[in-house]
Interface confidence: low
């Protein structure tokens, strides 16, 4: 099975080759070069020397090879690079390239999503009700939820709102939303609400919101 | 584990369609291609195509061209396969198997029966 | 496209004895730059999905049995099953991965 490696978006990944090199063979010795699951080439380093005529365009640049620990770092991460990689080690003999090694690696590219934000897109309305939005944005993979909490004194209840998604064509991030109408005809005590956003990983959870009810005004005295 | 859990078995008639799914489960769909591959009773292995699923590009068996239309849905991490202008030689078990270099997971194939 | 011919397309061999079959392509499938061929060989059994026994013509698929192995290089490949099991009884088809995908018509193998 591959290795499983993970990294985040615009960031360094590093793919390893695990070459325990037991010959104590010299990289003047070895061709090593990395490849993806469509047969693109990263990076070569034939006989110690890096090699770009082999290297793909959408890879030129973007990588560097650790001759110590073996190891391809690739730069400025983009969600379009996960996948499989395979890194493969010949010995260059006078008779011919043999394969002495070959890692594969399956690697997953995350982008942390930003901490969820309410904002109210109506004032409250009579006492009654509050249209808010919760929103957090450029993350990757999709959430998995996203909901509100509604916190008074006396009690906490969770609304599980339909999140509403996006996704950047060119960086295949997403935005995620949800809209919450809350009603509380009845609330008299202040509310603070809160915003949920819950990855494989991780649970995001906004600053508090509080709504300040204001105390209900006496009736006017009654005049005969 | 990894698993590809295909619909079930089809009986149409000559000159419909019908339209195969494949279910992946256990693994990252977007990361591997998808293969399918038919066999009709008695016969062999014949490729039919294959959907990369990440670039969004497919690759035909010339054969199959105008027959057959691979698609995926990636929010439910499953593949189609719709197959056209349904002729009793299309009565076969169609396979979908998961691939980067080579095929190592399949399906556990449909059996499409075209018959009036 | 390329053509993969195996032979041949039926096999009786005793218990415990050697089957071999051959696959031959009708263009090279040796990627000169990973010195990879992209040769895979596949085991179906009646009403069962293949299953991969061998890739890049000779690496070994977990979990497969070490009497099954792979053999050749660039238009010619073997499989070799060094000491037939009765639960070997099936259908071996040899594929390649070099230029889209083909597979051999198959090799029947049955026990003697």
């Known amino acids: 099975a591959p290795l499983k490696i993970q990294a985040y978006f615009n960031e360094t990944a590093d793919l390893p080759c695990q070459f325990a090199n037991s010959q104590n063979q010299s990289l003047s010795e070895l061709v090593v070069f990395w490849q993806d699951q469509e047969n693109l080439v990263l990076n070569e380093v034939y006989l110690g020397k890096e090699k770009f005529d082999s290297v793909h365009s959408k890879y030129m640049g973007r990588t560097s090879f650790d001759s110590d620990s073996w190891t391809l770092r690739l730069h400025n991460l983009q969600i379009k690079d996960k996948g499989l990689y395979q890194c493969i080690i010949h010995h260059k003999k006078p008779t011919g390239m043999i394969r002495i090694h070959q890692m594969n690696s399956e690697l997953s590219v995350l982008a942390n999503f930003s901490q969820p934000e309410i904002v109210p897109i109506s004032n409250i309305t009579e006492n009654v009700y509050i249209n808010l939005t919760c929103s957090s944005i450029h993350g990757y993979p999709e959430p998995k939820k996203m909901s509100v909490l509604l916190r008074t004194k006396n009690s906490t209840i969770e609304y599980d709102g339909v999140m509403q998604k996006s996704q950047d064509n060119v960086t295949e991030l997403y935005d995620v939303s949800i809209s919450l109408s809350v009603s509380f005809p009845d609330v008299t005590s202040n509310m603070t609400i809160f915003c949920i956003l819950e990855t494989d990983k991780t649970r995001l959870l906004s600053s508090p919101f509080s709504i300040e009810l204001e105390d209900p005004q006496p009736p006017p005295d009654h005049i005969p | 584990q990894v698993q590809l859990v295909q619909s079930g078995a089809e009986v149409k008639k000559p000159g419909s369609s019908v339209k195969v799914s494949c279910k992946a489960s256990?693994?990252?769909?977007?990361?591997?291609?998808i293969q399918w591959v038919r066999q009709a009773p008695g016969q062999g292995l014949e490729w039919i195509g294959v959907?990369?699923?990440?670039?969004?590009?497919?690759n035909y068996n010339q054969k199959f061209k105008g027959k057959a239309t691979m698609t995926v849905d990636k929010s439910t991490s499953t593949a189609y396969m719709e197959l056209s202008s349904l002729r009793s030689e299309d009565t076969a078990v169609y396979y979908c198997?998961?691939?980067?270099?080579?095929?190592?997971?399949w399906g556990q194939g449909t059996l499409v029966t075209v018959s009036s | 496209d390329i053509v993969l011919t195996q032979s041949p397309d039926s096999l009786a061999v005793s218990l415990g004895e050697r089957a071999t079959i051959s696959c031959k392509s009708s263009?090279?499938?040796?990627?000169?730059?990973?010195?990879?061929?992209?040769l895979a060989w596949y085991q179906q059994k009646p009403g069962q999905p293949p299953k991969l026994l061998i890739y890049?013509?000779?690496t070994r698929e977990s979990g497969v049995p070490d009497r099954f192995s792979g053999s050749g290089s660039g238009t010619d490949f073997t499989l070799t099953i060094s000491s037939l099991q009765a639960e070997d009884v099936a259908v071996y088809y040899c594929?390649?991965?070099?230029?889209?995908?083909?597979f051999g018509q198959g090799t029947k193998v049955e026990i003697k």
């Open positions: 198997a998961r691939a980067a270099w080579y095929m190592d997971y």
């Open positions: 256990g693994y990252t769909f977007t990361d591997y291609a």
């Open positions: 959907i990369n699923i990440y670039y969004d590009n497919t």
């Open positions: 263009q090279s499938l040796l990627n000169s730059r990973t010195r990879e061929n992209y």
């Open positions: 890049w013509a000779s």
């Open positions: 594929t390649q991965s070099y230029n889209l995908y083909t």
